[in-house]
Amino acid sequence: TQNKALPENVKYGIVLDAGSSHTSLYIYKWPAEKENDTGVVHQVEECRVKGPGISKFVQKVNEIGIYLTDCMERAREVIPRSQHQETPVYLGATAGMRLLRMESEELADRVLDVVERSLSNYPFDFQGARIITGQEEGAYGWITINYLLGKFSQKTRWFSIVPYETNNQETFGALDLGGASTQVTFVPQNQTIESPDNALQFRLYGKDYNVYTHSFLCYGKDQALWQKLAKDIQVASNEILRDPCFHPGYKKVVNVSDLYKTPCTKRFEMTLPFQQFEIQGIGNYQQCHQSILELFNTSYCPYSQCAFNGIFLPPLQGDFGAFSAFYFVMKFLNLTSEKVSQEKVTEMMKKFCAQPWEEIKTSYAGVKEKYLSEYCFSGTYILSLLLQGYHFTADSWEHIHFIGKIQGSDAGWTLGYMLNLTNMIPAEQPLSTPLSHSTYV
C-alpha cells in the first residue's frame, strides 16, 4: 500500500529584530519532538519591515501599528492557522532604542508600549517587546552561529555538513555590526576575563563555556559616521567639510541639529556659527582611516590589554563569524571571499573610495544613493574596527569568515534569543534516542 504522510508535527516561533535602522521579522520552524536536539531549528522566512527603526517613531507612535502590519500579516500567511495560538512572538530592540532610552526613558517606554499593544492584536502568543542589553545581543549572536555550525553537538563527524566547519568542537567567535552598536564575543584561550561585566558563563548540552563579550554602543556603522562628522566639523574652517570617506564629487548638506540629535555625538558637541554644512567628498582611504582611528581612544587601558576606550579585550582566539553589517557591506564590496587577504581588502578599498561619485552612481544604478554613498566609509570603518579596534592582524584576518546565512538561517542574535526563551538549549546533553519517530506509516 501507498505510504501516507502523517501531518507534520512542527512548531513555529517569531522574533522581531528592532534595530536602529530597520526592523526585521524572522520565522523559525522545528520538529516538535526534537526541540532539545542541536541544529534542528531553521529559519523559514525573513520579512523586512518597510521604514526606519522603531526609535524613529517617537513623535508618531500612532503609525507603529501600520508599520508592523505587512510583516505580521506575512507571518499569519506562512504559519498554519492551527498553529497561530501556540506560536510565540518576541520583539527585541537593540542599540537604537538603548540610545533613545538614554535620552528619555519615558519616550522609549511609550514606543515599546505602543509596539506591544500593536503586536498583541495578532492571533499569536505574544511574549512582549523589550530592549535587550548589549551583552545579550553579543551572547545570543554567539549562540546562534555556534548552534547553526553544529558546535554544540557532541557527535564528531568525519564529513562537513556546514561551510566554515573546522571539524572540531572549538566554537566560533561572533562579530556583529549594527547601525548603532557592535559586539565582539568569543571563548578566550585559558585567559581570565579581567572585567566581570564582560564575562558570561554558559552550560550548554553538558559543556561549560566561559565567554567574553562586549557591546560598543555608538560604534555601529551609522552612529560611528555621525561621531566622525561631529568630530571633523569641530575643526572645519567654514561650513564646508572636505571628507575623505566619501567619493570625489559627492556633495550632501547636513543639518547641525541632526548631527547633535544622537547621544553618540555629545562628546564632540560645540556651538557652530552655522546651522548647516556641506560634505564634499574627496575619496581618500588612508585619510578616512586616520579620521576613523581618532574615534578609538587607545591611550588608556586599566587591564592587561584593551580594545579601545578602556574596554578589556582578551587575546583573540580561533575562528570568527562576522555577520550583519560586517557581511552586508563586505558582500556589496565583493570582499567576502575566504581567499581575499587583508592587504588585498585594503587595496580594493583604496580603489573603491577613490572612484568618482558619478562613476559609482552609474556602476550601481539600482542602489539607493543614501546607502551607496556610505559604502566607502563603512568598508573603511570595518577595516579600522577589526584591525585597530579588535587587534586582528594580516595573519589572523584569515580567521574572519564573513557570514550572511548558515544552513539557510541568518546569522544574528534572533535565533539564539528564541532558543533561550523557548528553553530549547538544554544545560545537559539530552539522552540520545536511537530511532526518531517516523513520519510515515
Epitope: 500612532n62 501599528g65 511609550r110 505602543v114 506591544e116 500593536s118 498583541s120 505574544f126
Partner: antibody
Amino acid sequence: QVQLVQSGAEVKKPGSSVKVSCKASGGTFESYGISWVRQAPGQGLEWMGSIIPEFGIANYAQKFQGRVTITADESTSTTYMELSSLRSEDTAVYYCARESGGYRDHRLDVWGQGTMVTVSS
Amino acid sequence: EIVMTQSPATLSVSPGERATLSCRASQSVGSNLAWYQQKPGQAPRLLIYGASTRATGIPARFSGSGSGTEFTLTISSLQSEDFAVYYCQQYLLWPLTFGGGTKVEIK
C-alpha cells in the same frame, strides 16, 4: 482626582450592538490607557481591550477581536466600547478603568461605576 | 496568554484573624501583579500593585508578596469591611488577565 462616569444600563436584542461610554472628569486623559473589563453575573473579571485616547491606539483580547471596537473622543475626554453581534452570554456589567502607567504598567487604578448590559429576546 | 489561578476559591475567616490568599501565574510575570477588592454591587478597587506596593489609601493590614509565578495577599487582621472577593491580575503582557477570584467570607 480623576473619576470615570459611565453611561446607563442597556437592554439589547441578540444580534444587535451596544455602545457604552466612559467620561473622564476632574482631570485629563493625558497619555493613560483606558481598559474595558466585563463581569458576567456571579462570574469573575474579563479584560476586553484597551485604548490610548491620545493616539487612538486600541488593542483587544483575541476572544473579542472583530466584535469589539474601542474608540475615544479626546475633545470630550470620552472613551467608547462598542460590542456587536450580541448574544445572551454578553449579559454582564461592563467597566472602564484607567491604566495607571505606560509600558508594562497596566494596573487599573480608577474604575467607572459599571454599566449593566442585558441581552434578551 | 498568561493564565492566573487563585486559591482557595472561598476562604472562611473570623474577624480579627489573618487571611492568606494565593495567586499563581502560568509563566513568570516578574512583579507586574496587582490585587483588587470587590464588594457586591461595586466596581473593583486597586489594593496592591508591583506585587507588594499598597495603593493610595489602602490600610497597612493589606500586604502583598511574591514574584515570578507565586504571589500572596495577606490581610493581617480581618475587619468587617474586608469581607469581599479578591482578584489578582498580571500586567506584564497583553492580554491583561485576572485570576478567578477568592471570596473571603465570615466564618
